[in-house]
């Protein structure tokens, strides 16, 4: 028949060369001479020249080695001819596969391969997974099977055996405990992989497995005691620094400190920061200390990481023993404004008041007062005993000096320390009213109508307060009421000037006596202008001339 | 001489709870991962928990998951099996186990636990 | 159920040779060489007697050997003595959180 199996052909074959594979022969050769050829790829294509076939006889040729990862199958024709180039029989199927040898070793896919993994861990956590490729076939034959092995291990701490590697898969794993980041940071594996599934041809690459950091190390203070001196009274006053080592992995937060006072600061007055760099807890002061109250504060921080533990760690505590130092403080006034009420224009030496400072320091130091600040110089004060007089008219009135009936004086108080402190006082002098200003009307300057004229209405006003202002009464005085007359309206604050009498044009004075509720009297002279006219007017018309 | 000795076993009712111990002596306890394994009577060998050397990972198996707690004080060179919730299966000599690579070795001698009403 | 297979029982008389199998998987016995045995007399705790395959501890007679083909491990016990009557037990490391996988046990029953 005109057919022929699928021919085997190992790949590397030695030869000789050209070496006879199998024979094409057609049965139509008992009645003709029969001349065979073959095309395809590997005979008349690219690659050609790989096989060829004799002519006359049909035998198929190998005219060199054959190289499987190449080419791995050769698909040809064969085809029979009589001598006069008749075909005599339909092209062939010719299926030339290429078999394998083991003639490639495994190659891994990376010189150096990385992973990772949480110091810790226990067997069976997986690491990474290194890959190795064989051009082999792994299919047919085991020679491109590859098999993994870890050769070596470096460091080998704590024992040689801390890795495993999956013979097929390539994944890498733990199989022993004790990965300890601070003790080996990093492992280096050296790794086989090799063909023909573990007995062939080895490859080596490298493995290098970093170890993670957990949080399983406690910061710890070094050292846990401490004696600190703070003066009395410093606000955000650095105290101590407090130092810890940790032996997890530098500013990561199972590095990174946190403080907590545990213990001894009842009144809030400490509060405990991390420095950002050196990890040190920066103990400062919330609020000032106070020596004569408190003068020793013992502290208990306690320091944790940023991120939680991974298993249960003692915690450790440090003692901060802090002293307060005593300082000169300033004497304080009593109460720091005083308020007081003192009547007006009161006699000079008069008493007004005693304003005095208390000094926070135990010793019995000796306080002398004197004014800071009497912007009208009304007032003395006794430097031992801090005894106000007034030295000067105080006047309610004065309303460059007082404001809202209130006098405001700054005093001193100084301690004999060394150095001498100030403190400050205010006080407050409340006037009280006394009824020591009258009356006055407002305009004092008129101008009137002889006929038919207009009523003056004048408003009055007084500097005291009520009871000693309206209601106000009016009289005229002098022979004023000759010509004029005053009447007060009903509400008491303004006084009606009207002209009763003609007057030639001219200038006279009238003589307006006004007291208040409290009968306080003030004499005024209202410049009084009469012109010659009727009704209203503003300003005295001109002669007239006629024309 | 490396030595685990388990105690804590005894009997209890179903839902109740017990804690077994095992104090280690003769090598670095501290280093190694611990296991417990519990084999009921006339049957097999069966892991039950690990934990790793520092005690920050363990593990457990799906039948007792929940309801045991194993941990480890490494100043006192012990390890410990919390069982709560505890059932008639889980009836066992319990057996404490270092873990060496692939292997568990040493073990202790086992205490008994006994779940019934 | 075990997630290694071993027969329940064998047995052989005195002097002779016996071997016990466990059969795992390619992700277990097939994948690492970390094959243990243990040896368990009636009333006594576990006792390790062969790892990784075939790794013997120091005190352990060399009448016990170990192999590994495939996804099956084997353990040998030649010149059965009276002393061997006990349950074997294998182990194979495994990936995962259950990484130490037992067999069932098998029963050596010295005739």
């Known amino acids: 028949d005109w057919v022929v199996a699928p021919i085997s052909v190992p790949e590397n074959g030695k030869g000789p060369f050209p070496q006879r594979l199998n024979q094409l022969k057609s049965n139509k050769d008992r009645d003709t001479k029969i001349f065979y050829s073959i095309t395809g790829p590997g005979a008349d294509s690219p690659p050609e020249g790989v096989f060829a076939v004799e002519k006359e006889t049909g035998w198929l040729l190998l005219n060199k080695p054959l190289d499987r990862e190449e080419i791995a199958k050769y698909e040809l024709f064969g085809h029979a001819v009589s001598e006069n180039g008749a075909s005599v029989e339909d092209p062939m199927n010719i299926s030339i596969i290429v078999t394998d040898q083991n003639d490639h070793k495994p190659k891994f896919t990376q010189d150096t391969f990385r992973g990772s993994v949480l110091e810790g861990v226990l067997p069976g956590t997986s690491v990474m997974q290194v890959t190795a490729t064989d051009e082999d076939d792994a299919i047919y034959t085991y020679n491109g099977v590859v098999a993994y092995s870890i050769h070596s291990q470096e460091p080998k701490d704590p024992h040689d055996l801390m890795f495993t590697i999956h013979r097929s898969t390539g994944t890498i794993s733990v199989i022993s405990s004790g990965l300890d980041r601070e003790k080996v940071p990093e492992y280096t594996l050296t790794i086989q992989a090799t063909d023909m599934d573990g007995d062939g041809s080895t490859t080596t690459a490298v493995a290098v497995v970093e170890i993670l950091d957990a949080n399983d190390n406690a910061p710890m203070f070094d050292p846990q005691k401490y004696e600190a001196h703070v003066p009395e009274n410093a606000v955000g006053h650095e105290v101590q620094r407090l130092t810890v080592t940790d032996l997890d992995a530098p500013n990561s937060p199972a590095w990174r400190a946190t403080y907590l006072i545990m213990g001894g600061d009842d009144g809030d007055h400490f509060t405990i920061t991390t420095h950002p760099e050196s990890n040190q807890g920066i103990l400062t002061t919330r609020k000032g200390l106070d020596f004569e109250a408190k003068n020793q504060h013992t502290l208990y921080v306690e320091v944790t990481n940023e991120a939680p533990f991974v298993l249960k760690l003692p915690t450790s505590t440090a003692t901060i023993v802090v002293h307060v130092e005593d300082v000169n403080e300033a004497p304080v006034f009593v109460p720091p404004s005083k308020v007081v009420e003192v009547q007006e224009g009161i006699p000079t030496g008069e008493p007004v008041c005693v304003y005095t400072a208390e000094d926070p320091d135990k010793e019995n130091q000796k306080i002398s007062y004197r004014i800071l600040r009497d912007p009208a110089g009304w007032l003395a004060m006794d430097p031992d005993s801090g005894q106000v007089t007034a030295v000067g008219t105080l006047d309610r009135e004065d309303e460059q000096f007082v404001r809202n009936n209130i006098y405001e004086v700054m005093v001193l108080a100084m301690d004999n320390g060394s150095p001498p402190t100030t403190g400050t006082g205010t006080l407050l002098l409340t006037l009280i009213d006394v009824n020591d200003h009258g009356p006055v009307p407002e305009p004092r300057q008129i101008t009137i109508c002889n006929q038919s004229p207009v009523r003056q209405v004048l408003n009055i006003t007084d500097k005291d307060l009520s009871p000693h202002t309206s209601p106000f009464q009016a009289q005229l005085t002098d022979d004023s009421d000759i010509y004029w007359t005053a009447e007060v309206n009903e509400e008491g604050d303004t006084v009606v000037l009207s002209l009763k009498k003609f007057l030639k044009q001219d200038t006279y004075d009238v003589h307006l006596s006004l007291s208040d509720h409290g009968n306080k009297e003030q004499l005024t002279v209202i410049r009084a202008t009469v012109c010659d006219c009727h009704g209203h007017v503003e300003t005295c018309p001109g002669p007239w001339k006629g024309g | 001489e490396v030595q685990l000795l388990e105690s804590g076993g005894g009997l209890v009712q179903p839902g109740g709870s017990l804690r077994l111990s095992c104090a280690a002596s003769g090598f670095t306890f501290s280093s190694y991962a611990m296991s417990w394994v519990r084999q009921a009577p006339g049957k097999g060998l069966e892991w039950v928990s690990a934990?790793?050397?520092?005690?920050?990972?363990?593990y457990y198996a799906d039948s007792v998951k929940g309801r045991f707690t194993i941990s480890r004080d490494n100043s006192k060179n012990t390890l410990y099996l919390q069982m709560n919730s505890l059932r008639a299966e889980d009836t066992a000599v319990y057996y404490c186990?270092?873990?060496?690579?692939?292997?568990?070795?040493?073990w202790g001698q086992g205490t008994m636990v006994t779940v019934s009403s | 159920q075990s997630a290694l297979t071993q027969p329940a029982s064998v047995s052989g008389p005195p002097g002779q040779s016996i071997t016990i199998s466990c059969t795992g998987t390619?992700?277990?016995?097939?994948?690492?060489?970390?094959v243990s045995w243990y040896q368990q007399h009636p009333g006594k705790a576990p006792k390790l007697i062969l790892s990784?395959?075939?790794k013997r501890p120091s005190g352990v007679s060399n009448r016990f050997s170990g192999s590994k083909s495939g996804n099956t491990a084997s353990l040998s016990i030649s010149g059965l003595q009276a002393e061997d009557e006990a349950d074997y037990y294998c182990?194979?490391?495994?990936?995962?959180?259950?990484?130490?996988?037992f067999g069932g046990g098998t029963k050596l029953t010295v005739l």
């Open positions: 934990i790793s050397g520092s005690g920050g990972s363990t």
């Open positions: 186990a270092t873990i060496a690579p692939g292997r568990f070795d040493p």
């Open positions: 182990t194979s490391y495994t990936m995962g959180s259950t990484f130490m996988l």
């Open positions: 390619s992700n277990d016995v097939g994948a690492y060489n970390y």
């Open positions: 990784e395959v075939n």
